[in-house]
Amino acid sequence: DTEIKVNPPQDFEIVDPGYLGYLYLQWQPPLSLDHFKECTVEYELKYRNIGSETWKTIITKNLHYKDGFDLNKGIEAKIHTLLPWQCTNGSEVQSSWAETTYWISPQGIPETKVQDMDCVYYNWQYLLCSWKPGIGVLLDTNYNLFYWYEGLDHALQCVDYIKADGQNIGCRFPYLEASDYKDFYICVNGSSENKPIRSSYFTFQLQNIVKPLPPVYLTFTRESSCEIKLKWSIPLGPIPARCFDYEIEIREDDTTLVTATVENETYTLKTTNETRQLCFVVRSKVNIYCSDDGIWSEWSDKQCWEGEDLSKKTLLR
């Protein structure tokens, strides 16, 4: 009984199409597959950023795979051929591993790369990123930001830079069509006559860095002798009502402070007839149904009632 063997895939490589971290892993079928013409060969692919403890594992019949990586670090990948048990009259047969690596040769010392990169997607409409220049870089150093997400033909440079002392320290992005719920890749590189500048790579999803506008049109309504309903409207803009959480701060007679988090645009407050003053503010955040993370809005303008019997009227700002 001869032992069945299969070769690893050929020409295994990691290809960088210039998408700032979204890479192609590709390979060719193994040599000497003639014996297995009736068989569908599969490939087990493992890959990770160098330094990561865990491998991502994919089993595929294709000759390519695409995924996002952190280009601040190197990438390693390995692949082997799998012959299913149907092809071998018994157990699955695996080839040896073919391995490859990829990294961008770093230019410049780490301190020259941008510091404190911060990106906020204001009201799910306007993306603004800002950074500080690298430590010890001279004023002739300038930074350029490039971005890419699936749907763009190629990486694009920032349209509107924010400057300080002639240096680019931020970017206001143009309209980003169909850019949420997918990885958004950024590279900030730099140039200087004096020394090479280290590039920085960032990846995030836009819906997770949204800072909404604050709620508007805060009102009070007396529901009963001991209940007041606080109401407000969703912030203006494209974010649907179902995507909001709210935090309320209520102050009664300058003493009691009540805070609460709610999912819709009302909150019922128990009060006594002795309440002489009532103030509240609200802020908004994108909730877990629409994102994995988010940033609280600024607080709304304060809405106050004082001096009249709350039971007599609906109070509008």
Partner: antibody, heavy 119, light 111 residues
């Protein structure tokens, strides 16, 4: 609730200067560019310049030949436009107008300030 | 400076009919894969209102009957079904290069 509230109408003599203010509210002042646009009677709109309140960076329309100065006071969320060496053809309504970036146009405008230059 | 030329200067259209306004730039206003072309509506005694940015994107709160198209040097604003409240002057504007420049305006009236 975005609002841009401009200072009131002005009547000036030729050769004088005028300074128009624009108080912004309802948004984060430093996140948006502030443009100044004027409209003379029966004329097309004319862009005068813009300031980035975030960093104070300014672009001017060189057609105004150094007569225009745009400034901002971020603590007061207010932008200013000063036009010097006034002449009769500077009689116009002057608007401040907010825009996020060059690809977004100008989405909110002040109510306008009429400046009349007359001897 | 980039010169913006609008046509026609004035236009009379029946209620419910389509209105089309054209704008030509003296050079391309495309860059970074974006057309830096905006359209505004101005009613008497009021500041302009943003209708369309980046050639085809609707401004906030703009009715769906307003649409923009074009690239490079030639652009069009279309009102699919004219309403009485659409009577105004319409301006195109390029924001590719400083100084930003406006077209001369098109006065839209009801026939």
């Amino acid at each position: 609730q975005v609002q841009l509230v401009q200072s009131g109408a002005e009547v000036k003599k030729p050769g004088a200067s005028v300074k128009v203010s624009c108080k912004a509210s309802g948004y984060t002042f430093s996140n948006y560019l502030m443009n100044w646009v004027r409209q003379a009677p029966g004329q097309r709109l004319e862009w005068m310049g813009r300031i980035d309140p975030y960093d104070g960076d300014i672009d001017y329309n060189q057609n105004f030949k150094d007569r225009v100065t745009i400034t901002r006071d971020t603590s007061a969320s207010t932008a200013y436009m000063e036009l010097s060496s006034l002449r009769s053809e500077d009689t116009a309504v002057y608007y401040c107008a907010r825009g996020y970036g060059t690809a977004y146009g100008v989405d909110y405008w002040g109510q306008g300030t009429l400046v009349t230059v007359s001897s | 400076d980039i010169v913006m030329t609008q046509s026609p200067d004035s236009l009379a259209v029946s209620l419910g009919e389509r209105a089309t306004i054209n704008c030509r730039a003296s050079e391309s206003v495309d860059n970074y894969g974006i057309s830096f072309m905006n359209w505004y509506q101005q009613k008497p005694g009021q500041p302009p209102k943003l209708l369309i940015y980046a050639a085809s994107r609707q401004g906030s709160g703009v009715p769906d009957r307003f649409s923009g198209s074009g690239s490079g040097t030639d652009f069009t604003l279309t009102i699919s079904s004219l309403q009485a409240e659409d009577v105004a002057v319409y301006y195109c504007q390029q924001s590719k290069e400083v100084p930003w420049t406006f077209g001369g305006g098109t006065k839209l009236e009801i026939k």
